[in-house]
């Protein structure tokens, strides 16, 4: 299918002008190639009328032009002084007329209505309000005022000053007669319907002295705004319906093949399951305007969208609406990042998030999509280092690998972490993406002690067991803080050949803190990586306590390397299930924020990678 997109149907009246905007993928080639507007003939050939290379056909001379906007990936064709002869089938496109990089546009130019002299024309969008002004002479001031609608040769009474209201206008029309001295009455019609379209007649008095005024009411369906977005990207529909519906339920719906409109989301809590995890209705402003964000755009999301207001939260005739025609470009610059990432309970996930590579300095964010009501996405972590409190010690956002991708690591997974998450930046909003985390059956590959208590001034050794499948990858320990995870210095303790024939069940990489200081308290992660790509991580919390007086019981400070499934106990720390280790306050009364700068100096923190059988090996 062609990636060029424009309006399918354009209609206008003789003598008027039209402006036709066509969209194309803004690749370097497309930006500089020829743009054209051509008319399809009976033979099927498309005859150029105007092009970006300066050509204008004789028929269009002096009344048409084509302007390219390469930075936006759009070009605009303006045609003035329209005549009925301009009605027909056209194409806007790129390159050669016959190549297929084009979009079909139907232009219909109609004859303007023949209106009686002195007719006032009112042009109003459907659902809005019109005020028809009806002047009268002094002698008709005390007499009956009325508004009629002309249908063919007959006139049907709509409203009069004797309290008659035509049933078709019930609860949405009023006739206002001003105080003395003002020789004008007004008729206000709210929530206009397409069927209200037509010629009206104001009348004051009767007989030959009556006052009459013609009004032509043109009720328009809102012209859909064309929206051109990339596959996998994000779109925002801004909906401003006016103060009069500020307190009415709002909705976004999509027009289906039956020309009815299926609710996508509304403020009453309804949401189409096809948009689960990738839609938000942002709270409305005081003026009643609101916006709907959809991420992870799919080709099947294409179509006509309407936003509106109604107490039922769905489309009803005569209520204000706004319209968009969404085109999803498959020649997307947005990469195919994962829509689902799976991890095991107790394990971890490393999520790769795309961003516009031209915006490497932008702030990166990760938020959790919550579906309740209109949906919300509270931030969990950002590249400046803020982490929501309940995620302390188990969530980190890394700028790596860079060049259009950042990484988010979440560990100590529980079934409660299953759900939808959004990758965001403070830059190009079209690059918002959604990823679903699923928790599957299985065991974490990395095994660390449940929790560890270290003794001030002593040596602490924490083991991390890893399986053979990680033997060829880099292993690391790092100290977690809310600005990231500072890698601790590693020590290569032997030849890497020790890992080549990996036939034992597991291997070991150990973290040594020597001597333990107060600043060592906190979360530590053991992980595997390959260059800038992160694999599994496991977290352990280290609590630091004073040396015990003789007679008290604690784990030998020199070693905390219990077998992977053992609980590590001490007199100062109650036994806690691994999955509950999310809040350091469960462990320690005093939480000292570690100074990560302290980690690099000297040999007080080291990582030792070895097999479980022998001390050979390295952390590569």
């Amino acid at each position: 299918k062609s990636p060029v997109f424009g309006p399918q149907e354009v209609s206008s009246v003789e003598g008027n002008s039209v402006s036709i905007k066509c969209y194309y993928p803004p690749t370097s080639v497309n930006r500089h190639t020829r743009k054209y507007w051509c008319r399809k003939g009976a033979s099927g050939r498309c005859i150029t009328l105007v092009s970006s290379e300066g050509y204008v056909s004789s028929n269009y001379a002096g009344r048409a032009n084509l302007t390219n906007f390469p930075e936006n990936g759009t070009f605009v064709v303006n045609i003035a002084q329209l005549s009925r002869d301009d009605s027909g089938h056209y194409k806007c496109g790129l390159g050669i007329n016959s190549r297929g990089l084009s979009f079909d546009v139907s232009l219909e130019v109609s004859q303007g209505p023949e209106l009686p002299n002195g007719t006032e024309v009112y042009t109003v969008d459907v659902g809005r309000t019109v005020t028809i002004k009806c002047p009268f002479k002094t002698e008709n001031a005390p007499k009956t005022k009325a508004l009629y609608k002309k249908i063919g040769q007959t006139s049907v009474l709509v409203i009069d000053s004797r309290n008659y209201v035509n049933p078709n206008y019930k609860d949405r029309i009023r006739l206002r007669i001003p105080g003395t001295g003002q020789l004008i009455f007004t008729v206000v019609i709210d929530r206009l319907r397409l069927s209200d379209h037509g010629l009206y007649l104001c009348q004051a008095g009767d007989g030959s002295n009556r006052d009459e005024k013609n009004a032509d009411l043109q009720v328009l369906e809102p012209e859909p705004e064309l929206v051109y977005e990339d596959l996998r990207g994000s779109v925002t529909f801004h909906c401003a319906l006016g103060l009069e519906v500020a307190n009415v339920a709002k909705f976004l719906c999509r027009v289906n093949s039956r020309e009815t409109c299926d609710v996508v989301i509304n403020t009453l809590g309804k949401r189409d399951s096809a948009f689960e995890g990738r839609i938000l209705l942002n709270p409305q402003d005081k003026d009643g305007s609101f916006s709907v964000v959809i991420t992870g755009l799919r080709k099947e999301d294409e179509g006509r969208y309407l936003c509106g207001a109604h107490s039922d939260g769905q489309l009803q005739e005569g209520w204000p609406i706004q319209a968009w025609q969404l085109f999803v470009n498959e020649e997307s610059t947005i990469p195919r990042s994962p829509t689902v990432v799976k991890g095991v309970a107790g394990g971890s996930v490393a999520v790769l998030c795309p961003y516009n590579p031209k915006e490497s300095q932008s702030l990166k964010y990760w938020c959790l999509w919550e579906g309740a009501q209109n949906g919300r996405c509270p931030l969990l972590v950002e590249s400046q280092g803020l982490v929501q409190e309940q995620y302390e010690g188990r969530l980190s956002l890394l700028q790596e690998p860079g060049n259009g991708t950042f990484t988010v690591i979440l560990n100590q997974l529980t079934t409660q972490d299953a759900g939808f998450y959004w990758c965001l930046t403070n830059g190009d909003t079209r690059w918002r993406t959604t990823v679903e985390i699923k928790i599957i059956e299985g065991e974490p590959n990395l095994k660390v002690p449940g929790n560890v208590t270290a003794v001030l001034g002593e040596t602490l050794n924490i083991p991390c067991h890893f399986p053979c499948k990680f033997s060829s990858y880099e292993k690391y320990w790092c100290k977690w803080s809310n600005t990231g995870c500072q890698t601790l210095p590693s020590q290569d303790e032997g030849p890497s050949e020790a890992f080549v024939n990996c036939d034992e069940n597991s291997r070991l990489v150990s973290l040594t803190l020597n001597p333990v200081t107060r600043a060592d308290e906190g979360w530590y992660w053991c992980g595997v990586k390959q260059g800038h790509f992160y694999g599994e991580t496991a977290a352990v919390y280290v609590a630091v306590e004073e040396k015990k007086v003789a007679g008290s019981r604690y784990v030998s400070p020199a070693k905390a390397d219990a077998a992977p499934d053992e609980k590590v106990l001490d007199s100062g720390v109650r036994e806690i299930e691994n999955k509950a280790i999310q809040d350091p306050r469960l462990f320690a009364e005093e939480k000292v924020v570690a100074d990560t700068g302290d980690q690099a100096g000297g040999s007080r923190a080291s990582v030792d990678s070895s097999s479980s059988e022998e001390q050979g090996g390295s952390s590569k």
């Epitope: 195919r336 990042s337 790769l352 790509f533």
Partner: nanobody, 138 residues
Framework: QVQLVESGGGLVQAGGSLRLSCAAS????????MGWFRQAPGKEREFVAV????????YYADSVKGRFTISRDNAKNTVYLQMNSLKPEDTAVYYC???????????????????????????????WGQGTLVTVSS
């Protein structure tokens, strides 16, 4: 939706070879990691091998390492399992499976090593074939 159909199973003598194929329908084949599992009578389904979407990363169960080779042809939407030096204990129904893998053949989202995902668990995979029987006689 992805449909998977295995073929190539049969009876073979110990020490012999077989090549299993798995044909996938669905245009997103190239964005899925493809794995082989096997299930012997009365036993649990067991991981055999997995290959990343690009074919650049593979991972094998220790029991088949050096004897089996997994490969894929994205143009043909097919994944293969070449089985050499077959043993009687390799007798099982072999299943092909696919799971969405982080990574892409487009720029910016690079491929992570397949070992970094829990691909040795059946629940990691989204789609499964019906299986093909391999019998190794002694």
């Amino acid at each position: 939706q992805v449909q998977l159909v295995e073929s190539g199973g049969g009876l073979v003598q110990a020490g012999g070879s077989l090549r299993l194929s798995c044909a996938a329908s669905g245009r997103t084949f190239s964005s899925y990691a493809m794995g082989w599992f096997r299930q012997a009578p009365g036993k649990e389904r067991e991981f055999v091998a997995v290959i990343s979407w690009s074919g650049g990363s593979t991972y094998y169960a220790d029991s088949v390492k050096g004897r089996f080779t997994i490969s894929r042809d994205n143009a043909k939407n097919t994944v293969y399992l070449q089985m050499n030096s077959l043993k009687p204990e390799d007798t099982a129904v072999y299943y092909c499976a696919s799971g969405e893998q982080p990574g892409s053949n487009r720029p910016y989202i690079p491929e992570q090593p397949i070992e970094f995902m829990p691909t040795d668990y059946p629940s990691w995979y989204d789609y499964w074939g019906q299986g093909t029987l391999v019998t190794v006689s002694s």
